[in-house]
C-alpha cells in the first residue's frame, strides 16, 4: 500500500485511567497531512466522536479511560501529498500497584516512569502528562509510598517536584496525581514513578537540561501571535549561553530587518544548587514560511526544537 512502517517503543500503561498518544513524527507531521488511527490492523478507523471512550482527537488517540481489553498494536497513518507513513505503537495495559510495598519497582515501565535523584543535590522529578488540548489538567499532587508529600524540602513547580538536598530516604515509589476534565467529565490520572538515587554527578559537570521544548511540534493558526518559552535548568556557576536560533543563526539576526520573530529577555529562578532559566521566542505574526522549520533553543551544548504546524482542518465548520 506504499506506506513506510515505523515501529515505536512499547508503552506500558495503567488500567482505569486516561491515556493519550500523539501521532507526531517531525518533520513528516509538520506539513499538510491527514492522520488516521486504527487498532490491530483494522480497516475501520478509530472513532472521532468525542463521546466515545476511545476516539481520535486531532492527531491524538485518546482513551477515557484505558481498560484491560485495550492492549494491542495501534497504527496511525500519516498521509501527505507525496508520502505515507504508518506508525505502530504497542500498548500494554497492566493493573497499577503503586501502593503494593512488596513490589520493588516495576521493571517494565517506560523510561519516563523511572527517574533518578542525585544524592546531596537539589534535583527534581517530572510528572509526564501528554494529553491533547481538549483535556484540562488540574493541579498536581505528589505522593511517596502512598502518602501525600509535604515538607519544606519539596516544592511543586508546574509538572515537576523539586527536591532539595536529596537523601537516600528519597528513593522508592512515587506517584503524581491530577484530575483531568474532558467534555465535562472528570478522570483521575495517577502516574507511578520508581525513583532511584545516585551519588554520580549527573551530567558530569555543567551540561544544561532543557525541560521544554522537547523536539515537539505546536499547532498554530496562520497570522496569529505566538510566544514559546524555553525552560532550562543549569548549575549556578554555569557560563552557558542560552538563545533561540533558526537555520543556525540567532533569531534576532535572522529576522533583523522585519523584527517579526524576536528572542525575549532571559529570566531565572534560583534554587539551592541550580538555576531555572526561561528565554522566550515571540512570533508577532506566524507566516507560512515558519511551518516545518525547526526553531532551536540552545543552552551550552544542549539543544531542542519546536516546529510550527498548521492545525488539522476542522470539518465541523463545514
Amino acid at each position: 500500500d506504499g506506506c513506510n512502517d515505523i515501529f515505536m517503543k512499547n508503552e506500558m500503561l495503567s488500567a482505569s485511567q486516561p491515556f493519550a498518544f500523539n501521532c507526531t513524527f517531525p518533520p513528516i507531521t509538520s506539513g499538510e497531512v491527514s492522520v488516521t488511527w486504527y487498532k490491530n490492523s483494522s480497516k475501520i478507523p478509530v472513532s472521532k466522536i468525542i463521546q466515545s471512550r476511545i476516539h481520535q482527537d486531532e492527531t491524538w488517540i485518546l482513551f477515557l479511560p484505558m481498560e484491560w481489553g485495550d492492549s494491542g498494536v495501534y497504527q496511525c497513518v500519516i498521509k501527505g501529498r507525496d508520502s505515507c507513513h504508518r506508525i505502530h505503537v504497542n500498548l500494554t495495559v497492566f493493573e497499577k500497584q503503586w501502593c503494593d510495598t512488596s513490589v520493588k519497582g516495576l521493571p517494565n515501565l517506560s523510561d519516563e516512569y523511572k527517574q533518578i535523584l542525585h544524592l546531596g543535590k537539589d534535583d527534581s522529578l517530572t510528572c509526564h502528562l501528554h494529553f491533547p488540548k481538549s483535556c484540562i489538567l488540574g493541579p498536581i499532587k505528589w505522593y511517596k509510598d502512598c502518602n501525600e508529600i509535604t515538607g519544606e524540602r519539596f516544592t511543586v513547580l508546574e509538572t515537576r517536584l523539586l527536591v532539595s538536598n536529596v537523601s537516600a530516604e528519597d528513593r522508592g515509589n512515587y506517584a503524581c496525581q491530577v484530575i483531568l476534565t474532558h467534555s465535562g467529565k472528570q478522570y483521575e490520572v495517577l502516574n507511578g514513578i520508581t525513583v532511584s538515587i545516585t551519588e554520580r554527578a549527573g551530567y558530569g559537570g555543567s551540561v544544561p537540561k532543557i525541560i521544554y521544548p522537547k523536539n515537539n511540534s505546536i499547532e498554530v493558526q496562520l497570522g496569529t501571535t505566538l510566544i514559546v518559552d524555553c525552560n532550562i535548568t543549569d548549575t549556578k556557576d554555569n557560563t552557558n549561553l542560552r538563545c533561540w536560533r533558526v537555520n543556525n543563526t540567532l533569531v534576532d539576526d535572522y529576522y533583523n530587518e522585519s523584527k517579526r520573530i524576536r528572542e525575549g529577555v532571559e529570566t531565572h529562578a534560583s534554587f539551592r544548587e541550580y538555576n531555572l532559566y526561561t528565554v522566550n521566542i515571540t512570533f508577532l505574526e506566524v507566516k507560512m514560511e515558519d511551518y516545518g522549520l525547526p526553531f532551536m533553543c540552545h543552552a551550552g551544548v544542549s539543544a531542542a526544537y519546536i516546529m510550527l504546524q498548521l492545525p488539522a482542518p476542522d470539518f465541523r465548520a463545514y
Epitope: P107, I197, T198, E199, R200
Partner: antibody, heavy 120, light 106 residues
Framework: QVQLQESGPGLVKPSQTLSLTCTVS??????GYWNWIRNHPGKGLEYI?????????YYNPSLKSRVTISRDTSKNQFSLKLSSVTAADTAVYYC??????????????WGQGTLVTVSS | DIQMTQSPSSLSASVGDRVTITCRAS?????MYWYQQKPGKAPKLWIY???NLASGVPSRFSGSGSGTSYTLTISSLQPEDFATYYC?????????FGQGTKLEIK
C-alpha cells in the same frame, strides 16, 4: 531478571584496540547507568567508566585518552573500546549495572566477565 | 583522587572467628559499597549505602562507618565467607575501589 553478557576477542595484539560488547536483557539501557570494570590478574578491581541513561559517558581519568564507551539502544547493548593496548591492559573485563533497592550505584548485576590477553 | 586503603590486605582466620575489615578513604565519602569476589567469579554486591545487606547476604555480616573510616564485620566466620572483599566509593570521581582484603582459612 536483569542479565548482562560480555563478548569480544580474548586476544588482542599490543598497540591495537580492544573491543568488547555487553548485551543486556531484562532491562533497558535507556534507564540507569551501565558500567565497565576490570580485574587485573592477581590484582584488584579498577573502575573504567560508564554510559548513562541519557547517553552521557564518564571515563576514569587514568584511561580517558584511550577509552570510548558507546551504546546501541536498538540492540540494548553497550560497548567498550580501549585503544593502544599494552600488556598492562590484560585483565578480566566486566560489565555491570546497579539499581538494586533503587540505588543506581549498588552494582548488583554483573556479566560473567571475559578475559582479554594483550600479547603478540 | 580519593584513595581507598583496605586493611589488612590479607587475613587468616578460623571458622567461628569475628572478623573486621577496614576501608579508609583519603577524603570524606558519603556512602561505602562492599563486594565479595571468589576466584574465577564476578564480584557480588555485598553491602550498599554503608550498612544495607544485599539480597541473600547472611545477617552475620554488617557494615558501618562514616566520613573516611568504614568497616565490614563478620560476627562468626563460616566456610563460605572465605573470599576477597572490596570496598568502593561513588562520592567523588574517579570512582575507586580498595585494593581488596583476601580472607583465608587458617
Amino acid at each position: 531478571q536483569v542479565q548482562l553478557q560480555e563478548s569480544g576477542p580474548g586476544l588482542v595484539k599490543p598497540s591495537q584496540t580492544l573491543s568488547l560488547t555487553c548485551t543486556v536483557s531484562g532491562a533497558s539501557i535507556t534507564s540507569g547507568y551501565w558500567n565497565w570494570i576490570r580485574n587485573h590478574p592477581g590484582k584488584g578491581l579498577e573502575y573504567i567508566g560508564y554510559i548513562s541513561y541519557s547517553g552521557y559517558t564518564y571515563y576514569n581519568p587514568s584511561l580517558k585518552s584511550r577509552v570510548t564507551i558507546s551504546r546501541d539502544t536498538s540492540k540494548n547493548q553497550f560497548s567498550l573500546k580501549l585503544s593502544s593496548v599494552t600488556a598492562a591492559d590484560t585483565a578480566v573485563y566486566y560489565c555491570a549495572t546497579g539499581g538494586y533497592d533503587y540505588v543506581e550505584d549498588a552494582l548488583y548485576y554483573w556479566g560473567q566477565g571475559t578475559l582479554v590477553t594483550v600479547s603478540s | 583522587d580519593i584513595q581507598m586503603t583496605q586493611s589488612p590486605s590479607s587475613l587468616s582466620a578460623s571458622v567461628g572467628d569475628r572478623v573486621t575489615i577496614t576501608c579508609r578513604a583519603s577524603s570524606n565519602v558519603r556512602y561505602m559499597y562492599w563486594y565479595q569476589q571468589k576466584p574465577g567469579k564476578a564480584p557480588k554486591l555485598w553491602i550498599y549505602l554503608t550498612s544495607n545487606l544485599a539480597s541473600g547476604v547472611p545477617s552475620r555480616f554488617s557494615g558501618s562507618g562514616s566520613g573516611t573510616s568504614y568497616t565490614l564485620t563478620i560476627s562468626s566466620l563460616q566456610p563460605e565467607d572465605f573470599a576477597t572483599y572490596y570496598c568502593q566509593q561513588f562520592t567523588t570521581s574517579p570512582y575507586t575501589f580498595g585494593q581488596g582484603t583476601k580472607l583465608e582459612i587458617k
